[in-house]
């Protein structure tokens, strides 16, 4: 006999990276017929929603109107059908950005490279941080973590045309409080692929959210819960 229901999906809209003082909605999708959803923050009950009518609703939204560092952290949700509770969702890491300062991002040997060359990004931030994150825009982007007193190195490659794109970096004051994004660096990769290794398999996060962090019009993005979920769960591990 089944003791628990399948775990729900959890994700953030428009994005799990939220500029301070901006709004964000945490979504939890369970099953039709669920009479109660609970949102947990850092292991404690944070909010409850009871959809009406439950048989017509399989998703609830928890609205945060004003993002700040106190609201940043790990969220999970569960739902109940009758007396039976679900497994908890995966953890959603909700990150507050645009805190304090702006890092600078540079790329060596330069922004225009030839396929097969090795590339290193350097992210620098003079304020008190020791963790840095390099993110590439786009649906199948890459996230790298680096450490250093005021700057971190992010080796890439040998590059292929798959590495083309726009990169930004953040300084991280803690796992869930990030700096402003750096100015973008656009990496251009030209030439044939000559015995190069494939791009590294890093966690992905969905499409273009820079500047205003608004959701793009890409179809199906809001339904791509597993991708959001996977990113939020793995980005900071």
């Amino acid at each position: 006999q089944q003791q628990t229901l399948p775990k729900p999906f959890i994700w953030a809209e428009p994005h799990f990276m939220v500029p301070k003082e901006k709004q964000v909605t945490i979504c939890c999708q369970g099953n039709y017929g669920a009479v109660e959803y609970q949102l947990h923050f850092e292991g404690s009950l944070f909010a409850v929603d009871r959809p009406k009518p439950p048989e017509r609703i399989n998703k609830v939204q928890f609205y945060i109107p004003d993002m700040n560092s106190r609201m940043a952290g790990q969220y999970s949700c569960i739902y109940r059908v009758g007396e039976l509770w679900s497994e908890p969702s995966n953890l959603l890491d909700l990150v507050v950005t645009e805190m304090y300062d702006t890092p600078t991002l540079s790329v060596h040997p330069g922004p225009e490279v030839i396929s097969g060359e090795k590339v290193t990004f350097y992210c620098r931030l003079d304020t008190a941080t020791s963790m840095f994150l390099l993110l590439k825009e786009g649906r199948s982007s890459h996230v790298q973590r680096g450490y250093g007193k005021v700057q971190a190195e992010f080796p890439l490659g040998p590059v292929t045309t798959a590495h083309r794109g726009t990169y930004r970096c953040f300084g991280s004051y803690n796992n869930h409080a990030w700096s402003f994004p750096s100015e973008p660096v656009k990496l251009l990769v030209t030439g044939d692929i000559e015995n190069t290794s494939l791009a590294p398999e890093d966690p992905t996060f969905p499409a273009d959210t820079w500047g205003t962090y608004l959701l793009t019009t890409e179809t199906g993005l809001q339904k791509d819960h597993a991708l959001w979920d996977h990113t939020a769960q793995n980005l900071l591990r």
Epitope: L105, S106, P109, G110, G116, E117, K118, Q151, G191
Partner: antibody, heavy 115, light 107 residues
């Protein structure tokens, strides 16, 4: 065209410091890495470190971290390398070289450490 | 630190001869390799970047290639001004490192 101007020579006392200059022209100074390279008489080339003038990002070879300090003055498009606590081992020609791929080289400054 | 082992350290050859210099990388450097030429007065000039791309103004007799971790500079027909020093340089990973150099001498 790209030019990197370095003084021909510097004579310094042991234990003193020296600040070498490299004046850049013919390109956007803040958009390219500037590397520094050492060559002792009759020896090969050794990379010291690099600086990105647009952001002051620096990167040093571990063995030069306590010896060399790289800085830039973007208003005059000049890169500097300060060498401290000089000994006879620091007597060498020092080159500045532009771009992540070491595309253009200065003529080098001969530093002689002598009492 | 990536070691660049350059060979030979010196080479005697005749005008018009074809010669090859080699650098072996101790770790993967992709195509991030330069060949540099140094004149007796100390002037340094880049000949080849990214393993095989020829710098503008460099004669076509110079070419670069790669086979696995071995990188080669070939001069197809030696001219008198080619009898100088040559260095390879990897810029894949810091600290960036040079080969020990090759002194090309006229036979």
């Amino acid at each position: 065209q790209v030019q990197l101007q370095q003084p021909g020579s510097e004579l310094v006392r042991p234990g003193a410091s020296v600040k070498l200059s490299c004046k850049a022209s013919g390109y956007t100074f803040t958009s390219y890495w500037m590397h520094w390279v050492k060559q002792r008489p009759g020896q090969g080339l050794e990379w010291i470190g690099t600086i990105y003038p647009g952001s002051d990002i620096t990167n040093y070879d571990e063995k030069f971290k306590n010896k060399a300090t790289l800085t830039v003055d973007t208003s005059s498009s000049t890169a500097y390398m300060q060498l401290s606590s000089l000994t006879s081992e620091d007597s060498a020609v020092y080159y500045c070289t532009r771009d992540g791929r070491f595309a253009n080289w200065g003529q080098g400054t001969l530093v002689t450490v002598s009492a | 630190e990536i070691q660049m082992t350059q060979s030979p350290s010196s080479l005697s050859a005749s005008l018009g001869e074809r010669v090859s210099l080699t650098c072996r990388a101790s770790q993967d450097i992709g195509s991030s390799l330069n060949w540099l030429q140094q004149e007796p007065d100390g002037t340094i000039k880049r000949l080849i970047y990214a393993t095989s791309s020829l710098d503008s103004g460099v004669p076509k007799r110079f070419s670069g290639s790669r086979s696995g971790s071995d990188y080669s500079l070939t001069i197809s027909s030696l001219e008198s001004e080619d009898f100088v020093d040559y260095y390879c340089l990897q810029y894949a990973s810091s600290p960036y490192t040079f080969g020990g150099g090759t002194k090309l001498e006229i036979k």
